[in-house]
Interface confidence: medium
């Protein structure tokens, strides 16, 4: 029988009546067009919905948009288009929602061709009121909020000017011209690249990297010959053109660009690219594209300075620049990442790491699944996960993998079971232990979401036909109940729930189509009466993360420590609640070789924890560049993984000697950097 349909499943009592009393329909008085939805603030219940409709006339396109607001998690909506003077809002800029609970919203309006500048509507009270502001420029990008101060905004203009506002968009000042890319850093710092000659495209590889720490009063050039730059965790990266040829190298700074070191990564040619896959304050995952149009590259993981890199995974699937990669951070369990590799026969396989890139393995075959036609051996195969690449290839995959930090251990994804990803219709699989073990959860493709920190999982079948049924589970996907939320099926377009998975409300979006018109409609279902009571201590159980052998003293040790979590029992039907905080208990582990990465010039042979010297570097002095000086590395091949907290155990010695020689780096050394003031 299908998962969840056997006799063992305990039914949730009277759920139809409970859900019917908590199902709220809203029909939008709108022609269909497009719809976008944004949550304003955290736990406020405020949702903004923007519907836009384009009518193509003979010579031009006539646009109309409407703005709706809900303050009860989508149960009721009010048309507030009059607050923005019935202006047409540009959907390509979306709704710029302020950070944290600032309550700030910026909408960018469409203006007629001959106007001097653009127009925005600003709200700082969770969209209760809006102020119209005419801009002295035409915006090219959405307004970007400073993460530290939501009154500070930056935007690029269509003429490549960098504009800054210090009073939440009331007044704007152009602080620099000829700007290609601008980003907020920490402490209200702005980093941006500028061109000198023709344009951003023409000057690619000859751009300058600038920094301002005082919103444009003064500037410092922190890099030249820049191709591009990026920020990740506490690291600032720049790809820099080499002097002699058309290759580029990554340079890294941990002091906002005052000093730079050359990253020990391969250089790339004109057709190749670098990509920061993930970064935190400890380390970085960096993808380096292979030469040629291969569609794959290599993942490297950094040390705590972002300078020395270890090869983490070969043949990592990543199509051309700005293309698709399946790299996914499993946010429900520390250290876990999933991605895809392109094997020699051009099939795509899923790999998982539980130790932040130290070692990658295939996903264990779900116990309740058979190997499909891709499997050579019908008894031995793996689970392969569909992510961004499958979606881009228009496979029948409506959603990428899903995990939430407060739904500990839960990962939901579409997948197939075989030797590689299959083009057949996928099923939905769930892991409750962060990816170690998997179970088929639902037959066929579905949309899914997590509510109440994992207390409820909701799913809707992906179908081309109109739908009127939603499925839900209160036991992490083991058993499913179905609820008919409307008599009249709708063409489903999406599930919406408040980010953070703490809500108990889900909104089902779609449209109804009749002979004459089509209209947007939403159904918001509140599950609060399904989870009747608040969870108590007895509803939780201790769970050791990363556990593979419960008796083993080292069981659960990942990155030098283990964590015990209090997790909701699958059999408990109760509310974690909006204030639920994950209870975790860390304890330090003894150091083993698993707590060390292979140092520069070393690698780990497959199925071996020891680091051995790379044959091509044997007998050579290991020299690398640090803060513009050459360093000599004396190593026995190991360095501690960034963020690893182990104590005692093994302790391989590592020593770096300063050779006090200049690096052969073409990058600006600190003493050559210049500053200027406005």
């Amino acid at each position: 029988s299908a998962p969840g349909e056997d006799e063992e499943c305990g039914r949730v009592r009277d759920f139809v009546a409970k859900l019917a009393n908590n199902t709220h329909q809203h029909v939008f008085d709108d022609l269909r067009g497009s719809v976008s939805l944004s949550w304003v603030g955290d736990s406020t219940g405020v949702i903004l919905v923007l519907t836009t409709f384009h009518v193509p006339l003979v010579i031009m396109t006539f646009g109309q948009s409407k703005l709706y607001r809900s303050e009860d998690y989508g149960k009721n909506f009010k048309d507030i288009t009059d607050l923005i003077n019935n202006t047409f809002i540009r959907t390509e800029f979306g709704m710029a929602i302020g950070p944290e609970n600032s309550g700030k919203v910026v909408l960018t309006a469409e203006v007629s061709g001959g106007s001097r500048g653009g127009r925005i509507f600003r709200s700082s009270d969770f969209a209760k009121n809006f102020v119209q502001t005419d801009l002295p420029f035409h915006p090219l990008t959405q307004m970007m909020y400073s993460p530290q101060n939501s009154d500070y905004l930056l935007a690029l203009s269509t003429e490549n000017g960098l504009w800054v506002s210090k009073n939440f968009g009331g007044k704007w000042e152009e602080i620099h011209k000829a700007v290609c890319l601008a980003k907020w850093g920490s402490d209200n710092t702005i980093f941006f690249t500028t061109y000198a000659n023709g344009s951003c495209k023409a000057d690619l590889g000859a751009l300058e990297l600038w920094r301002t720490s005082d919103l444009g009063k003064s500037f410092k050039t922190i890099g030249v010959k820049i191709y591009s730059f990026g920020l990740g965790g506490r690291f600032l990266f720049a790809s820099v053109m080499a002097d002699k040829d058309t290759t580029r190298r990554i340079h890294v700074s941990t002091d906002q660009g005052d000093t730079w070191s050359m990253a020990q990564l391969p250089s790339v040619g004109q057709e190749q690219f670098y990509s920061i896959l993930a970064a935190n304050d400890d380390m970085v995952f960096m993808h380096v594209d292979e030469p040629g149009d291969t569609g794959f590259g290599t993942i490297f993981t950094s040390d705590d300075r972002g300078i020395v890199y270890s090869k983490s995974l070969d043949r990592h699937l990543y199509t051309t620049t700005g293309g698709e990669t399946d790299f996914t951070n499993v946010t429900s369990l520390r250290g876990v990442y999933i991605t895809s590799v392109l094997s020699e026969d051009n099939s795509i396989q899923t790999m998982i790491t539980f130790d932040q890139g130290g070692r990658w393995t295939h996903l264990r075959k779900p116990e309740n699944s058979e190997c499909d036609a891709t499997a050579k051996n019908k008894n031995e195969c793996s689970l392969h996960i569909h992510a961004s690449y499958s979606i881009s290839q228009k496979l029948n995959v409506p959603m990428a993998p899903l995990s939430e930090p407060n739904a500990v251990g839960i990962v939901i994804a579409h997948g197939s079971v075989g030797d590689a990803i299959s083009v057949m219709v996928p099923d939905v699989y769930i892991s409750d232990d962060g990816g170690y073990s998997w179970t088929k959860m639902l037959e066929g493709p579905h949309y899914y979401t997590i509510l109440d920190s994992g207390g409820i999982i909701v799913a809707i079948e992906h179908s081309s036909r109109p739908i009127n049924v939603i499925k839900f589970s209160t036991d992490e996907g083991q058993c499913w109940q179905t609820y008919t939320f409307t008599r009249d099926p709708i063409y489903f377009t999406g599930l919406a729930s408040e980010p953070g998975a703490r809500s108990m409300n889900i909104s089902i979006w779609g449209f109804t189509e009749s002979f004459l018109t089509s209209q947007w409609v939403s159904y918001t279902i509140d599950f609060k009466d399904i989870l009747e009571r608040n969870c108590e201590e007895k509803d939780y159980t201790i769970w050791l993360a990363h556990s593979t052998d419960p008796e083993d003293y080292e069981d659960g040790c990942i990155l030098g420590y283990k964590e015990q979590f209090l997790r909701l029992r699958k059999s408990s039907v109760c509310q974690n609640g909006r204030d639920y905080v994950v209870t975790k208990q860390p304890s330090i582990c003894l150091c083993s070789l698993e707590d060390f990465l292979c140092d520069f010039g070393y690698y780990r042979p497959e199925n071996d924890s020891k680091c051995v010297e790379q044959p091509e570097l044997k007998g050579h002095d290991l020299e690398f560049c640090l803060y513009g000086r050459e360093e000599h590395l004396t190593t026995n091949g190991y360095r501690k993984i960034p963020g690893d907290k182990c104590q005692g155990g093994v302790n391989p010695v590592r020593e770096v000697k300063d050779l006090k020689k200049k690096c052969t780096s073409n990058f600006l050394s600190p003493e050559k950097q210049n500053s200027k003031s406005n």
Epitope: L544, D549, D552, E554, Q585, S592, Q647, G648, V650
Partner: antibody
Framework: EVQLVESGGGLVQPGGSLRLSCAAS????????MSWVRQAPDKRLEWVAI????????YYSDTVKGRFTISRDNSKNSLYLQMNSLKAEDTAVYYC???????????WGQGTLVTVSS | DIQMTQSPSSLSASVGDRVTITCHAS??????IGWLQQKPGKAFKGLIY???NLKDGVPSRFSGSGSGADFTLTISSLQPEDFATYFC?????????FGGGTKVEIR
């Protein structure tokens, strides 16, 4: 029945050596970390050393580091503590204790007395 | 090293009394604390692990509470067999450290 039995204690002169043993029974010895803990005459407990389940990884308290060595033989279900350069302040009852991934001192032996005196 | 300060060092109580022993860690240790019982001539016995979890076979009159740096062992109704010395131990990080012990005597 889960049991730990220590042996090898006795009287030794300062600077001398002694090797303690702990025989385990009633559980899968090779999957548990094992510790030595000592109780001084004033009844204070001090954790001495730990060894991982496979025997590869060890950790010592600063007071014994460089002088004591913890080891195990999983084929014999035995834990050892080699004590060199003994000092008067090492005088104590020495206990071996079992550590699982969930609970660090869940089973103890009866202890063996080590007296360091001239 | 993390210091574990246990109090009181001794106490006198009668059968049926409610007894509370506290342990303070010099820094946060989450819930990585255990409570042990020692009786003369007997092996140490683990009572509570992870601050609040009762080890199998331990009577429910024993309970643990606290998190972070302050922890309590409570015996809700003292029985004749509970007269012993109790120790707390932290295992959040190396070196593991013990409290000084609390001797529970008959009044």
């Amino acid at each position: 029945e889960v049991q730990l039995v220590e042996s090898g204690g006795g009287l030794v002169q300062p600077g001398g050596s002694l090797r303690l043993s702990c025989a385990a029974s009633g559980f899968t010895f090779s999957t548990y970390g094992m510790s030595w803990v000592r109780q001084a005459p004033d009844k204070r407990l001090e954790w001495v050393a730990i060894i991982s389940s496979g025997g590869s990884y060890t950790y010592y308290s600063d007071t014994v580091k460089g002088r004591f060595t913890i080891s195990r033989d999983n084929s014999k279900n035995s834990l050892y503590l080699q004590m060199n350069s003994l000092k008067a302040e090492d005088t104590a009852v020495y206990y071996c204790s079992r550590s699982s991934s969930h609970w660090y001192f869940d089973v103890w032996g009866q202890g063996t007395l080590v007296t360091v005196s001239s | 090293d993390i210091q574990m300060t246990q109090s009181p060092s001794s106490l006198s109580a009668s059968v049926g009394d409610r007894v509370t022993i506290t342990c303070h860690a010099s820094q946060g240790i989450s819930s990585n604390i255990g409570w042990l019982q020692q009786k003369p001539g007997k092996a140490f016995k683990g009572l509570i692990y992870h601050g609040t979890n009762l080890k199998d076979g331990v009577p429910s009159r024993f309970s643990g509470s606290g998190s972070g740096a302050d922890f309590t062992l409570t015996i809700s109704s003292l029985q004749p067999e509970d007269f012993a010395t109790y120790f707390c131990v932290q295992y959040a990080q190396f070196p593991y450290t013990f409290g000084g012990g609390t001797k529970v005597e008959i009044r």
